[in-house]
């Protein structure tokens, strides 16, 4: 019978035991930076080439006995998970292994850096097809390791890493915290986050998605036909490296940004029990479990978007938080969130030739998050239109006035500390969906984009009585690009996108009381691209 | 301790070179920074990654490394260049005393220096 983890990542229509995914990653080379491996294991024999690269520290302690099978255990298992004949994800992928971890599973940042440099030089000397680099290791936050990962990613390499097994914020570890790397947390057969001894999988905004990482059967270095169960975020990352190899084999021209968006899009949504995570991390942690796409082609027509959370701003009055999209992505909207509700909104601004999303803390606030909605929109031309605070009681409004530009997101930013406390709600005039509306004391920012075939519409869901959460979702075939609240009253903690749903959070109802201020409206901007759909049909 | 001493026996004492006197000050207004692992048991003091500014060529990296060795030697310190980086990041990996960090941070082209640290199988 098919092991649980392979069943979990396989789309339902392919769940037959004999399912052999097309290509199986045969056009892709996967580099593994790990322990030594047993390359003659029947699972991986002929699939893994052991390079002559080795950079490892001495083993600790006088009692340590170097036992070949123990030295090879981690790397052999992961190679099997990626490309093993019986228990592998991408059975056609070829692999190359670099030894950067010793027999105790320990390495150094410098050894890992030299390994990444080795891969880059190999790529330059002998360019092959798409490259995936699997980094099933973690250390403390390292600026230099993150920088090296960024450079390699910008050279067209897909890096996949373990989130870490420390039951902690993945942003405190490297390479997990590198934005260019695909960072993977671990879940079990019950779609619960994995517990390992007293610890478990890492979590937080630096995790891109989760994948099976507990009780994973794979090649054992005890003998050439042995199997063993291993667990950890390394195993989870190996699943995603295998899925990435499959996707790249089917579509070799995919960029890192496109691959990441597809991994997110095809993941199982909202299946993880978030109660396992610390309360303050739940909103930041993606509720996504990786899966193979249902078919190798036909995803190109989709408008893909993802949500990127910033680091926390910190509590000082003028503190700000910035969320950025990847170089190939467009920032289509910007929102903010504060647990205390004390914030001064958010704005989209240019930084280094690219738009970023900046959120502003307010006096007495515990800090804010900026939330960017980052999308793949080829040939897009986006700009931000700003209306300064209006004097009129009707409030501030701004629209997309350029021909062919559509509204993809609304942001508002204010200087006063208690905007909306004594103000009546501002209502959007009907029949004017292509504009952003806000308080008269607020600056309003409209994200306006022109792209072939791009069309957008506004969808609202209002609740008259106060509720902790109001949501509005885009329907099938449409993608959420913008998420904001109307009106920006003081009890609104903020707005953010979760998959295709706009979530507006308010203060605990018991503390708010039901007043005229209680009305909360979630505003979603839903877009689609007819151009992408036509291009996809022409390809088929 | 014995291991460490053994390692240092291999280190080449860098002789004072002519170019040592040419040490130019780092570009005005930019100060190189030092970073180390926040988790103390994972730190590996004595080994440092010296990262140079983005457009630095390999020859400049080698020259900066030699300059560090020469300036350290003048102060009576042994250093060993373990690796010169190029291809991803310009810079070098050096085994040296932490006493030399202040000196190393003032070298031309230096962007930042990071103390080496451990990584672990997950």
């Amino acid at each position: 019978s098919i092991p649980w983890n392979l069943e979990r990542i396989t789309p339902p229509r392919y769940r037959a035991d004999e399912y052999q995914p097309p290509d199986g990653g045969s056009l892709v080379e996967v580099y593994l930076l790990d322990t030594s491996i047993q390359s003659d294991h029947r699972e991986i024999e002929g699939r893994v080439m052991v390079t002559d690269f080795e950079n490892v520290p001495e083993e600790d302690g006088t009692r340590f006995h170097r036992q070949a099978s123990k030295c090879d255990s981690h790397g052999t298992h992961l190679a099997g998970v990626v490309s093993g004949r019986d228990a592998g994800v991408a059975k056609g992928a070829s692999m190359r292994s670099l030894r950067v971890l010793n027999c105790q599973g320990k390495g150094t940042v410098s050894g890992t850096l030299i390994g990444l440099e080795f891969i880059r030089k190999s790529q330059l000397v002998q360019p092959v097809g798409p490259l995936v680099v699997l980094l099933p290791l973690a250390g403390g936050y390292s600026r230099v390791l993150n920088a090296a990962c960024q450079r390699l990613a910008r050279a067209g390499v897909v890096l996949v890493t373990a989130a870490g097994n420390f039951r902690d914020d993945a942003c405190l570890y490297s390479p997990a915290s590198a934005p260019e790397v695909i960072t993977v947390g671990a879940t079990n057969a019950q779609d619960q986050p994995v517990t390992l001894g007293t610890l478990g999988t890492n979590f937080g905004r630096c995790v891109d998605l989760f994948a099976p990482g507990e009780d994973i059967i794979g090649a054992s270095s005890d003998c050439s036909t042995c199997f063993v169960s291993q667990s950890g975020t390394s195993q989870a990352a190996a699943h995603v490296a295998g899925i990435a190899a499959m996707m790249l084999s089917a579509e070799p021209e995919l960029t890192l940004a496109e691959l990441r968006q597809r991994l997110i899009h095809f993941s199982a949504k909202d299946v993880i029990n978030e109660a396992w995570f610390p309360e303050d991390q739940r909103v930041l942690t993606p509720n996504l479990v990786a899966a193979l796409p249902p078919s190798t082609h036909g995803a190109g027509w989709q408008l893909f978007c993802r949500t990127v959370w910033s680091a926390h701003s910190g509590p000082t009055r003028m503190a700000t938080a910035v969320a950025r999209c990847a170089p190939d992505e467009e920032l289509l909207s910007c929102s903010s969130f504060s647990r205390s509700g004390k914030r001064r909104g958010e704005r989209m601004e240019a930084q280094g030739g690219k738009l970023v999303c900046r959120a502003h803390n307010a006096f007495g606030g515990e800090g804010v998050y900026a939330i960017a909605r980052c999308c793949l929109l080829p040939q897009a031309n986006c700009s931000v239109h700003t209306a300064p605070p209006a004097e009129a009681s009707m409030g501030t409004r701004v629209h997309c006035h350029q021909q062919g530009h559509v509204l993809t997101g609304c942001s508002s930013h204010w200087e006063v500390e208690d905007l909306g406390t004594h103000k009546p709600p501002v209502l959007r005039p009907r029949g004017q969906p292509n504009q952003c509306v806000g308080h008269r004391e607020a600056s309003i920012h409209a994200s306006c984009c022109h792209a072939p075939g791009l069309e957008c519409k506004v969808k609202e869901h209002g609740i008259p009585a106060p509720q902790e959460q109001v949501t509005v979702a885009c329907e099938e075939g449409w993608t959420l690009t913008g998420c904001s609240a109307l009106p920006g009253t003081s009890h609104v903690l903020g707005a953010y996108a979760v998959d295709n749903t706009c979530v507006v959070r308010s203060r605990d109802v018991s503390t708010t009381g039901s007043t005229s201020e209680g009305a909360v409206t979630a505003v979603a901007i839903c877009c689609r691209s007819r151009h992408l759909a036509q291009a996809s049909q022409e390809l088929q | 301790q014995e291991d460490e001493d053994g390692d240092y026996e291999e280190l080449v004492l860098a002789l004072r070179s002519e170019e040592d006197g040419l040490a130019e000050a780092p570009e005005h207004g930019t100060t190189a920074t030092f970073h180390r692992c926040a988790k103390d048991p994972w730190r590996l003091p004595g080994t440092y990654v010296v990262v140079l500014k983005e457009e630095t060529h390999l020859s400049q990296s080698e020259r900066t490394a030699r300059r560090l060795q020469a300036q350290a030697a003048r102060r009576g310190y042994l250093t060993k260049i373990l690796h010169v980086f190029h291809g991803l990041l310009p810079g070098f990996l050096v085994k040296m005393s932490g006493d030399l960090l202040e000196l190393a941070l003032k070298l031309p082209h230096v962007d930042y220096i990071e103390e080496d640290s451990s990584v672990f199988a997950q």
């Epitope: 255990s73 599973g105 390992l196 059967i217 042995c226 063993v228 169960s229 291993q230 950890g232 | -």
Partner: antibody
């Protein structure tokens, strides 16, 4: 679905020998430790022995040490219990069971996390009597 | 060797009752304890592992707690299918031991 089927039980005289077999399906057999557990008539469960995936480690309850030998054949997906010098108190239903557990790295060491015996055979009866 | 002592040996209860079975270890076993259910003529079935983790497919009315030397198995609302014998098992080392069992019968 993993299945375990025991065989080889029967009636044997004190001092005699028997070899029990347990046939398993799928690669999952070779991925876990395996145990033999017995249950004397009307009594509770007693763990007898277990064996590592590759057969390199074996453990026994004190009462059978030196008399029983656990082994496995990965190629045949089979587990065995060779029982020698049998005694009347060895009379029981013998179950083979999968010891589900997993290895993981933490603090520079390879740790074992045990879940318990999650798959059991239907049992084979061994009667030691003259 | 570590000894496991279960109490009570027999427990009479009715459908809908909340029942608790206790297991004591002769020395600390951390959380390395499993609970099994066995019906007459059948093989045992794993219910709980690592003292409190529910095995896949086991109803949520079963729960486990404890660490060190004192452990409990709780059935929140007895169902007709739950009348059986329950065993605890320690696995602090690679050698295991079971408790003597608790027979849960209909009152």
């Amino acid at each position: 679905e993993v299945q375990l089927v025991e065989s080889g039980g029967g009636l044997v005289q004190p001092g005699g020998s028997l070899r029990l077999s347990c046939a398993a399906s799928g690669i999952t057999f070779s991925s876990y430790w395996m145990s033999w557990v017995r249950q004397a008539p009307g009594k509770g469960l007693e763990w007898v022995a277990n064996i590592k995936q590759d057969g390199s480690e074996k453990y026994y309850v004190d009462s059978v040490k030196g008399r029983f030998t656990i082994s496995r054949d990965i190629a045949k997906n089979s587990l065995y219990l060779q029982m020698n010098s049998l005694r009347a108190e060895d009379t029981a239903v013998y179950y083979c069971a999968r010891d589900r557990g997993t290895y993981y790295y933490a603090d520079g060491d390879y740790n074992y996390y045990y879940y318990g015996m999650d798959v059991w055979g239907q049992g084979t009866t061994v009667t030691v009597s003259s | 060797d570590i000894q496991m002592t279960q109490s009570p040996s027999t427990l009479s209860a009715s459908v809908g009752d909340r029942v608790t079975i206790t297991c004591r270890a002769s020395q600390s076993i951390s959380s390395w304890l499993a609970w099994y259910q066995q019906k007459p003529g059948k093989a045992p079935k794993l219910l709980i592992y690592k003292a409190s983790s529910l095995e896949s497919g086991v109803p949520s009315r079963f729960s486990g707690s404890g660490s060190g030397t004192e452990f409990t198995l709780t059935i929140s609302s007895l169902q007709p299918d739950d009348f059986a014998t329950y065993y605890c098992q320690q696995y602090n080392s690679y050698s295991y031991t079971f408790g003597q069992g608790t027979k849960l019968e209909i009152k």
